[in-house]
Amino acid sequence: KAMHVAQPAVVLASSRGIASFVCEYASPGKATEVRVTVLRQADSQVTEVCAATYMMGNELTFLDDSICTGTSSGNQVNLTIQGLRAMDTGLYICKVELMYPPPYYLGIGNGTQIYVIDPEPCPDSDF
């Protein structure tokens, strides 16, 4: 039994620096507690963007200062990352861990390439 994690290959952030994508996992067991972590890989550097642990059937709760929000539905997690700028362009990888009950399972997606384009500053208007 293995755990497969699927996520979209490419997402374009909105002009307000918001990007959303779905992370879906095929659970080999009946997990009641799941941890979802978003990792960013760019220039061979890996950083943890955010992480949340949730009980199946309950809402996904990130820390108050997190740039991520999300909702869960069954084996699907809808992730939203806010406050993105052009320099944040990179591969965002969804890591899913079935925490409880044992056995623990690990699943890592192939990553979603998020492209962020900084908006052009508004030209001064002469009115």
């Epitope: 293995a2 755990m3 890996v46 943890e48 623990y104 690990l106 699943g107 890592i108």
Partner: antibody
Framework: QVQLVESGGGVVQPGRSLRLSCAAS????????MHWVRQAPGKGLEWVAV????????HYADSVEGRFTLSRDNSKNTLYLQMNSLRAEDTAVYYC????????????WGQGTLVTVSS | EIVLTQSPGTLSLSPGERATLSCRAS???????LAWYQQKPGQAPRLLIY???SRATGIPDRFSGSGSGTDFTLTISRLEPEDFAVYYC?????????FGPGTKVDIK
């Protein structure tokens, strides 16, 4: 830099208890799965237990389930392994190890502490 | 649990030679969640490879990992004197996390 230092090993009689400590520095324990791995004299490596992230979830190898208990003191950035009802087959060097970013491979290890269970 | 078998048990080679170590799993190791470690006498193990083929920080490029599913290989392209040690594979896709019994690489 990341450092793990175990202590608390020694000689103990069968049926008795011992508590091992693992002092971590250079990172925050709660951001990682923290594991104990043991190695009996002249033998291979055996995974013993893990305490996950916020410390609520712990998983144990069948060989120690019900006898060993993991805990953590975040203020001291220290991990503990309470070993009860010790048996001769628990004799080993016990290593504290940090799980990796991409899963439970072990990217940093302590130097190990020897536990000898003998009458 | 996933049982890992390593072969050969002992590999006797000379410095400069190529070493090929095998690790076989009793069931598929999902998404190549397999690591390799090196251990020298009296020392803690050292991570060499994770994810079946990714080299850990500071590991020389003479070490390489490959494989998927149930069959994995660690290759040391040219043995250096400091490479003579015991090598373990480990799976981390599900608990309990298990190690192979090890392959000892010694000097011929």
């Amino acid at each position: 830099q990341v450092q793990l230092v175990e202590s608390g090993g020694g000689v103990v009689q069968p049926g008795r208890s011992l508590r091992l400590s693992c002092a971590a520095s250079g990172f925050t324990l709660s951001n990682y799965g923290m594991h104990w791995v043991r190695q009996a004299p002249g033998k291979g490596l055996e995974w013993v237990a893990v305490i996950w992230y916020d410390g609520r979830n712990k998983h144990y190898a069948d060989s120690v389930e019900g006898r060993f208990t993991l805990s953590r003191d975040n203020s001291k950035n220290t991990l503990y392994l309470q070993m009860n009802s010790l048996r001769a087959e628990d004799t080993a060097v016990y290593y504290c190890a940090r799980g990796g970013v991409w899963g439970s491979y072990f990217d940093y290890w302590g130097q190990g502490t020897l536990v000898t269970v003998s009458s | 649990e996933i049982v890992l078998t390593q072969s050969p048990g002992t590999l006797s080679l000379s410095p400069g030679e190529r070493a090929t170590l095998s690790c076989r799993a009793s069931q598929s190791v999902s998404s190549s969640y397999l690591a390799w470690y090196q251990q020298k006498p009296g020392q803690a193990p050292r991570l060499l490879i994770y994810g079946a083929s990714s080299r850990a920080t500071g590991i020389p490029d003479r070490f390489s990992g490959s494989g998927s599913g149930t069959d994995f290989t660690l290759t040391i392209s040219r043995l250096e004197p400091e490479d003579f040690a015991v090598y373990y594979c480990q799976q981390y896709g599900r608990s309990p996390f298990t190690f192979g019994p090890g392959t000892k690489v010694d000097i011929k």
